[in-house]
C-alpha cells in the first residue's frame, strides 16, 4: 500500500463549473433491501484518530480471540500480529484456536520503510459490532515485522478492504470482504465515517474516544447530511477514482487533469494525509501559501515536519483556504466536488505543547505514486464503498470538524468535458504496487 505517510505510520482539463445543472443521480433511486437505513449496532464501532489509524474490534478463532484491527481501504490482506512484539498488547495465538487451518504458505510484504511477513491460514472471523455473521477468512499471521506496528496505537492487525488484485502474495488470496459477501447475505457494500478529533488528544483520551463508524453492508442516514454523490471506481484494485479539477479557495489550479491522477488516485483510510503528485503538491502549496500570505510559516511546516502552535482556541482557521477536489460523476460530462477545510488538512498533534497551545501538522504531502485521499479527506465525509455498483459515494459527514463560518461540502453537478482523458494508464509491468 502507499507508504510515505502511509499507515501503519512509521502525514485540469475539467471545465469550469457552469450554471447549467444536470439531472442528479444520487439518493433518488429505488431502495435496495438491507442497503439503507439504520445500523445502530455498527454506529461508533471505530476508535482511533487520523495520525495512527482507525480500528474496529474483531474476533478470530475458536474460542474467539478479540483483537483491534486497523481499517485499511488501501490494501487487501487481513493480517494480524501472531507473535509477541513490544508494541502489541495482545496477538493472535493460532495454537489456541480449534478452527485454525494452516495454508502452508508464507507471505512477505515490504514497504519503502519497513515490512511485515507471516504465515497464511484461515480461521473463523467475526465483527462484534458488525453484521451478526461468522465467516471463514484468510488470515496472514504476522510473525515478523519492522516499522509496521505503532507504539500506543492500540491496534494489533490490519483489515485490507480493497480488491484481490493487490492482495499478497497474489490475487488468488481472497480478501476478507469478498469472503464475507460470498458466505453470507451481507450486501457487497460498506461505508466509513471517520471522525477526526479536531483537537489534540492525549493517550488516555484516544483510548476512550469514539473514532467513527464502519457500516458493513449498508448506509446509515444518520451519519451524513445532504445528498450522496457517487464517482465511478475506475478499476477494481485499489479504490481508484478520477479527479478532474482541483481548486484552492475557488481558484482553479489549472493543471492538465492527468496530473491529478498520475499515476492513480485512490481512496485510502490507511493513509493519514492527502497525498498529491509532486507537480500538483507544489502548485497546491504555492496556492495555499498565497491564500494565507498575511502569515509566514516555516519551511518545515509545509513539508509536514514542523508543527505550528497557537494559543489554545486562537487557531486562525480563516486565513487558510478550502480545498476542492472535483470527481468524475456517474453521468457523462458531469462532475461533483468535495470541499475540505483547514480543520481537515491541519492535523492536531498531541503531547508536544502545553495545554495552553494547539499545535498542528500540515497534512498534505508529496507522493510519487499518485493522489491518495487519506484520512484527512475522509474525515470530512461519509464515504460509501459501493462495490456492487462499482462506485464510491461522498456526503458531508455528520461528525466533521468545522467552524461557524465554513463547512465541508459535497456539491454538484458541474459540467466537465473529456473527463475520461483525466485518467492515467499505468504501463503494465511486474513491479510491485506495494513497493512505494
Amino acid at each position: 500500500t502507499q507508504h510515505g505517510i502511509r499507515l501503519p505510520l512509521r502525514s485540469g482539463l475539467g471545465g469550469a463549473p457552469l450554471g447549467l445543472r444536470l439531472p442528479r443521480e444520487t439518493d433518488e433511486e429505488p431502495e435496495e433491501p438491507g442497503r439503507r437505513g439504520s445500523f445502530v449496532e455498527m454506529v461508533d464501532n471505530l476508535r482511533g484518530k487520523s495520525g495512527q489509524g482507525y480500528y474496529v474490534e474483531m474476533t478470530v478463532g475458536s474460542p474467539p480471540q478479540t483483537l483491534n484491527i486497523l481499517v485499511d481501504t488501501g490494501s487487501s490482506n487481513f493480517a494480524v500480529g501472531a507473535a509477541p512484539h513490544p508494541f502489541l498488547h495482545r496477538y493472535y495465538q493460532r495454537q489456541l484456536s480449534s478452527t485454525y487451518r494452516d495454508l502452508r504458505k508464507g507471505v512477505y510484504v515490504p514497504y519503502t520503510q519497513g515490512k511485515w511477513e507471516g504465515e497464511l491460514g484461515t480461521d473463523l472471523v467475526s465483527i462484534p459490532h458488525g453484521p451478526n455473521v461468522t465467516v471463514r477468512a484468510n488470515i496472514a499471521a504476522i510473525t515478523e515485522s519492522d516499522k509496521f506496528f505503532i507504539n500506543g496505537s492500540n491496534w494489533e492487525g490490519i483489515l485490507g478492504l480493497a480488491y484481490a488484485e493487490i492482495a499478497r502474495p497474489d490475487d488468488s488470496l481472497e480478501p476478507f470482504f469478498d469472503s464475507l459477501v460470498k458466505q453470507t447475505h451481507v450486501p457487497n457494500l460498506f461505508s466509513l465515517q471517520l471522525c477526526g478529533a479536531g483537537f489534540p488528544l492525549n493517550q488516555s483520551e484516544v483510548l476512550a474516544s469514539v473514532g467513527g463508524s464502519m457500516i458493513i453492508g449498508g448506509i446509515d442516514h444518520s451519519l451524513y447530511t445532504g445528498s450522496l454523490w457517487y464517482t465511478p471506481i475506475r478499476r477494481e484494485w485499489y479504490y481508484e477514482v478520477i479527479i478532474v479539477r482541483v481548486e484552492i479557495n475557488g481558484q482553479d489550479l489549472k493543471m492538465d487533469c492527468k496530473e491529478y491522477n498520475y499515476d492513480k488516485s485512490i481512496v485510502d483510510s490507511g493513509t493519514t494525509n492527502l497525498r498529491l503528485p509532486k507537480k500538483v503538491f507544489e502548485a497546491a502549496v504555492k496556492s495555499i501559501k498565497a491564500a494565507s500570505s498575511t502569515e509566514k510559516f516555516p519551511d518545515g511546516f509545509w513539508l509536514g515536519e514542523q508543527l505550528v502552535c497557537w494559543q489554545a482556541g486562537t487557531t486562525p482557521w480563516n486565513i487558510f483556504p478550502v480545498i476542492s477536489l472535483y470527481l468524475m460523476g456517474e453521468v457523462t460530462n458531469q462532475s461533483f466536488r468535495i470541499t475540505i477545510l483547514p480543520q481537515q488538512y491541519l492535523r492536531p498533534v498531541e503531547d508536544v505543547a502545553t495545554s495552553q497551545d494547539d499545535c498542528y501538522k500540515f497534512a498534505i504531502s508529496q507522493s510519487s505514486t499518485g493522489t491518495v485521499m487519506g484520512a484527512v479527506i475522509m474525515e470530512g465525509f461519509y464515504v460509501v464503498f459501493d462495490r456492487a455498483r462499482k462506485r464510491i459515494g461522498f456526503a458531508v459527514s455528520a461528525c466533521h470538524v468545522h467552524d461557524e463560518f465554513r463547512t465541508a461540502a459535497v456539491e454538484g453537478p458541474f459540467v466537465t468535458l473529456d473527463m475520461e482523458d483525466c485518467g492515467y494508464n499505468i504501463p503494465q509491468t511486474d513491479e510491485s504496487t506495494l513497493m512505494t
Partner: antibody
Framework: QLQLQESGPGLVKPSETLSLTCTVS??????????WGWIRQPPGKGLEWIGM???????WYNPSLKSRVTISVDTSKNQFSLKLSSVTAADTAVYYC????????????WGRGTLVTVSS | EIVLTQSPATLSLSPGERATLSCRAS??????LAWYQQKPGQAPRLLIY???KRATGIPARFSGSGSGTDFTLTISSLEPEDFAVYYC??????????FGGGTKVEIK
C-alpha cells in the same frame, strides 16, 4: 551587509512601559523570507524569546508575556519595535533584536543588545 | 511543552581539547535544533541549525549531530575564542521559543 541595532531608554520605572526600537540597515525589513524578533536575557541567566513580527504586521508572542507585549513594524523606516507594559524588576535584562531566517526558524542575525534596567 | 536540558552545566577544558556538549529534548524534535554561542558581553551567534548544518562563516571545528531527542555539539579542538556559553534551541514546535539552559565552556 545586514545589521540590526537596538535603541531605547536604559532605565524604566516600575509599572511603566518599556519601549525599544530595532533599526535594520543593509537590507529590507520587507523580506518575505524573514521574521524579526525580540529575545531577552536577564543578568546571568538564559535566553527568553519575547515575540516576533512579519513585515505584513503578523505577530507571534510568548504566551507568558502576551498580555503585556506589543511588537509593531514600520516598513517605511525599516524598523520594528517592542513595547512591554507594567514592567517590574523581573523585566531587567539585555534585550536583543534578531532576524529569524533559515526557513523562518532560527535566529541567524542578532543586534548587539541593550541593557534595560527597571528601577525607581 | 518540550523542555531542553543541556549538560554538563559547565565544561572545564584546555585549548586543543575536544569539547562535547549535550542537549536532550523531553520528546522528539526531529532535526529541528540549533546551537548558539555567546561570549561575555556579546549577543548570541548561530553556529548550527537543523541539528548538523553549519551556519555561514562558522569554522569546520564546530559540528552538530543527533536527531529525535539527543543532540551533540562537538568542538573538535578548542581555540581560545571558543570559551563561551552555548545554548541549544528547538523549533520543531513553532514559533521558535524554546532554549536550553546553556553550557559554559571554561578554561581549565
Amino acid at each position: 551587509q545586514l545589521q540590526l541595532q537596538e535603541s531605547g531608554p536604559g532605565l524604566v520605572k516600575p509599572s511603566e512601559t518599556l519601549s525599544l526600537t530595532c533599526t535594520v540597515s543593509g537590507g529590507s525589513i520587507s523580506s518575505s523570507s524573514h521574521y524579526w524578533g525580540w529575545i531577552r536575557q536577564p543578568p546571568g541567566k538564559g535566553l527568553e524569546w519575547i515575540g516576533m513580527i512579519y513585515y505584513s504586521g503578523s505577530t507571534w508572542y510568548n504566551p507568558s508575556l502576551k498580555s503585556r507585549v506589543t511588537i509593531s513594524v514600520d516598513t517605511s523606516k525599516n524598523q520594528f519595535s517592542l513595547k512591554l507594559s507594567s514592567v517590574t524588576a523581573a523585566d531587567t535584562a539585555v534585550y536583543y533584536c534578531a532576524r529569524v531566517g533559515h526557513g523562518v526558524s532560527y535566529f541567524d542575525l542578532w543586534g548587539r543588545g541593550t541593557l534595560v534596567t527597571v528601577s525607581s | 511543552e518540550i523542555v531542553l536540558t543541556q549538560s554538563p552545566a559547565t565544561l572545564s577544558l584546555s585549548p586543543g581539547e575536544r569539547a562535547t556538549l549535550s542537549c536532550r529534548a523531553s520528546q522528539s524534535v526531529s532535526s529541528y535544533l540549533a546551537w548558539y554561542q555567546q561570549k561575555p558581553g556579546q549577543a548570541p551567534r548561530l553556529l548550527i541549525y537543523d541539528a548538523s548544518k553549519r551556519a555561514t562563516g562558522i569554522p569546520a571545528r564546530f559540528s552538530g549531530s543527533g536527531s529525535g531527542t539527543d543532540f551533540t555539539l562537538t568542538i573538535s579542538s578548542l581555540e581560545p575564542e571558543d570559551f563561551a556559553v552555548y545554548y541549544c534551541q528547538q523549533v520543531y514546535t513553532w514559533p521558535p521559543r524554546t532554549f536550553g539552559g546553556g553550557t559554559k565552556v571554561e578554561i581549565k
